[in-house]
């Protein structure tokens, strides 16, 4: 006989990422004896909640909680039974609920209460359902990316922890209702609301972060539609041959399109609108989303928001990734430079509906949105955030790192479960050959 070492016990954590268009559940795991190590927490499994985001259940809060049941039942299977009681469960809602909270705080509260009621019925250690601020969403996305890529600290072969010389990565997240940019900066922010000080593994990080509400993909598309209805009898970003009927109430119900709402509009009126495949007019329409007219600081990104110059490498995830991946994979277009990204956007915007459908078989209606989406991503990065060709070369578009989805959820859990200590880790026991 010989001694067989038992695998280390695993701990688990669950985060429900309640986005504006849908909810995703992430289950994370880590060895119980290495809780304070870096790069140790990874994704165990995930589950996409069917239906829309929880904010879409404003008129039916119980529907929001009911929608989560399938994934929660999966969690019961995915997490070993003996670990259920010790597994923290969090729900974080983002910009969809921030918007609902602005327009209908009572409905927002009701949805969170209904969801809380359901989550407490499960044997996990439920630790709350809340709406994240834009700043939290940005910072936790940055923490996730850098944690997964082991940019905070590494364990050296001589048995010592050290800070990698490569520095941290900036993070850019494009959600359904908001977009976030977060990166480490050396100088203090001129706008204190955009600065976060972090202490991780004994290191100090000064981080710039800003979240632009109403600049998520879905809300941008809705704002462009409102603009097209206002200024054209057609939609320049939609493909020629794409024909819709629009209920005005559906366009103007969002607080993001409130400014474009006609004074006396009939919410039940229907308008027919077709696409025109016009890249130049589409570019003009997208440009109208950004204002560069005033800046109360030494420099701004857009809409008078302070932003230091982008520095270092960046990871762009969520809808940034999906948009660029569509251009690269479905359309077969190069997007390695800003110039190529712009050319790819123009290429998609030139396609007719029949051409697009032939290129990407199946009647996927969201195909009609890729022109506007690509044009927006290109303009947001170049004109909005100020990436030039050199800086753009340092942007990677990624969905996962170390088999774990890049997003705010992991960073949120790491923070709330104290899996990233503020103090430096002690030396490991072992042989030092020096």
């Amino acid at each position: 006989t010989r001694d067989v070492r038992e695998p280390p016990a695993l701990k688990y954590g669950i985060v429900l990422d309640a986005g504006s268009s849908h909810t995703s559940m992430f289950i994370y795991k880590w060895p119980a004896d290495k809780e304070n190590d870096t790069g140790i927490v990874g994704q165990h499994s995930s589950c996409d909640v069917p239906g829309g985001g929880i904010s879409s259940y404003a008129d039916n809060p119980s529907g929001a909680s009911q929608s989560l049941v399938g994934c929660l039942e999966q969690a019961l299977q995915d997490v070993p039974k003996e670990r259920h009681a010790g597994t923290p469960l969090y729900l974080g809602a983002t910009a969809g609920m921030r918007l609902l909270n602005l327009t209908n705080p009572e409905a927002s509260t009701s949805v969170l209460m209904a969801v809380t009621h359901t989550l407490t019925q499960y044997p996990f250690d439920f630790r709350g359902a809340r709406i994240l601020s834009g700043q939290e969403e940005g910072v936790f996305g940055w923490v996730t990316a850098n944690y997964l890529l082991e940019n905070f600290i590494k364990y050296g072969w001589v048995g010592r922890w050290f800070r990698p010389r490569k520095g941290t990565l900036g993070a850019m997240d494009l959600g359904g209702a908001s977009t976030q940019i977060t990166f480490e900066t050396t100088s203090p922010a001129e706008d204190r609301a955009s600065e976060v000080q972090l202490h991780l593994y004994g290191q100090h990080y000064r981080v710039y972060t800003h979240s632009f509400l109403c600049y998520g993909r879905d809300q941008v598309l809705q704002r462009l539609l409102a603009s097209a209805l206002q200024t054209h009898g057609f939609h320049p970003c939609w493909p020629r041959g794409f024909s819709t009927q629009v209920l005005l109430g559906d366009v103007y119900q969002s607080p993001c399109t409130m400014a474009q709402r006609p004074q006396n509009f009939n919410s039940s009126a229907r308008v027919s609108l077709s696409g025109s495949s016009d890249p130049h007019l589409c570019r003009d329409l997208v440009s109208g989303l950004f204002s560069f007219s005033s800046c109360p600081f030494s420099r701004c990104s857009f809409n008078g928001v302070f932003q230091p110059p982008v520095a270092g490498n960046f990871v762009a995830f969520s809808a940034f990734f999906y948009t660029v991946d569509f251009l690269r994979t479905s359309m077969g277009l190069p997007v390695a430079t800003l110039q190529q990204l712009e050319a790819a956007a123009v290429n998609v915007c030139n396609q007719t509906w029949a051409q697009l459908q032939a290129r990407v078989p199946g009647q996927r209606a969201r195909l009609a949105d890729y022109c506007a989406g690509a044009m927006f991503v290109q303009q947001l990065l170049s004109r909005g955030y100020g990436f030039d060709e050199r800086a753009f070369g340092g942007v990677i578009f990624q969905k996962k790192a170390a088999d774990t989805a890049v997003g705010w959820a992991l960073g949120y859990m790491l923070n709330l479960t104290n899996l990233i200590p503020a103090d430096p880790p002690g030396l490991r026991k072992g042989t030092d050959f020096s």
Partner: antibody, heavy 124, light 111 residues
């Protein structure tokens, strides 16, 4: 109000071609929408056959691709179905319908305007 | 092609009661958090008429006693309270991918 009306022979011989016309009133077929043909078999099963879009592009059901042709005459505001090499299996009620993408944060293809249908029997 | 299977093939419901019709898809008809499922009503001698789009959105002019729910592969049409004029055949239809396909229909009879 948009109205559609099918017309054509009620009886077609096997191996021949079936030709039907859909006349549209109340809306120009070049202004927007997709102009579909759908058929309903004797057992009530519905099958989408294809469409011609407002700008003249076609989209056909792959199961009929080699036999179907949908064309239009914009001056008469009509669109047509031609189905070749028919068999008794093509006996059905044929409907023309106007469709479009209904917006609601995404786009949902619906067929909202229908003709009354015309019955076609394939028999020798 | 996406095959849609409706059940039951027919049902008889008393006036004022609830009618529930199920539609099961051979593959998910969801994309990007949206469900591409429509419901149509067809009365004898008439063409189909759109009732519900996007799984749960009521077409304008359709009474609120009609409601749709579901996502992924499982969808339901509910009618409550059932009225005399609701006697018809009901079809589900997916538009997530080409070609659009219809379910086999459910015939509703009022007792």
């Amino acid at each position: 109000d948009i109205q559609l009306q099918e017309s054509g022979p009620g009886l077609v011989k096997p191996s021949q071609s079936l030709s039907l016309t859909c006349s549209v009133t109340g809306y120009s077929i070049t202004s927007g929408y997709y102009w579909n043909w759908i058929r309903q078999f004797p057992g009530n099963k519905l099958e989408w056959m294809g469409y011609i879009s407002y700008d003249g592009d076609n989209n056909y059901n792959p199961s009929l691709k080699n036999r179907i042709s949908i064309t239009r005459d914009t001056s008469k505001n009509q669109f047509f179905l031609k189905l070749s090499s028919v068999t008794t299996e093509d006996t059905a009620t044929y409907y023309c319908a106007g469709g479009y993408y209904r917006y609601g944060l995404s786009y949902y293809y619906v067929m909202d305007y229908w003709g009354q249908g015309t019955s076609v029997t394939v028999s020798s | 092609d996406t095959v849609l299977t409706q059940s039951p093939a027919s049902l008889a419901v008393s006036l004022g009661q609830r009618a529930t019709i199920s539609c099961k898809a051979s593959q998910s008809v969801d994309y990007d958090g949206n469900s591409y499922m429509n419901w149509y009503q067809q009365k004898p001698g008439q063409p189909p008429k759109l009732l519900i789009y996007a799984a749960s959105n009521l077409e304008s002019g359709i009474p609120a006693r009609f409601s749709g729910s579901g996502s992924g592969t499982d969808f339901t049409l509910n009618i409550h309270p059932v009225e005399e004029e609701d006697a018809a055949t009901y079809y589900c239809q997916q538009s997530n991918e080409d070609p659009p396909t219809f379910g086999g229909g459910t015939k509703l009879e009022i007792k």
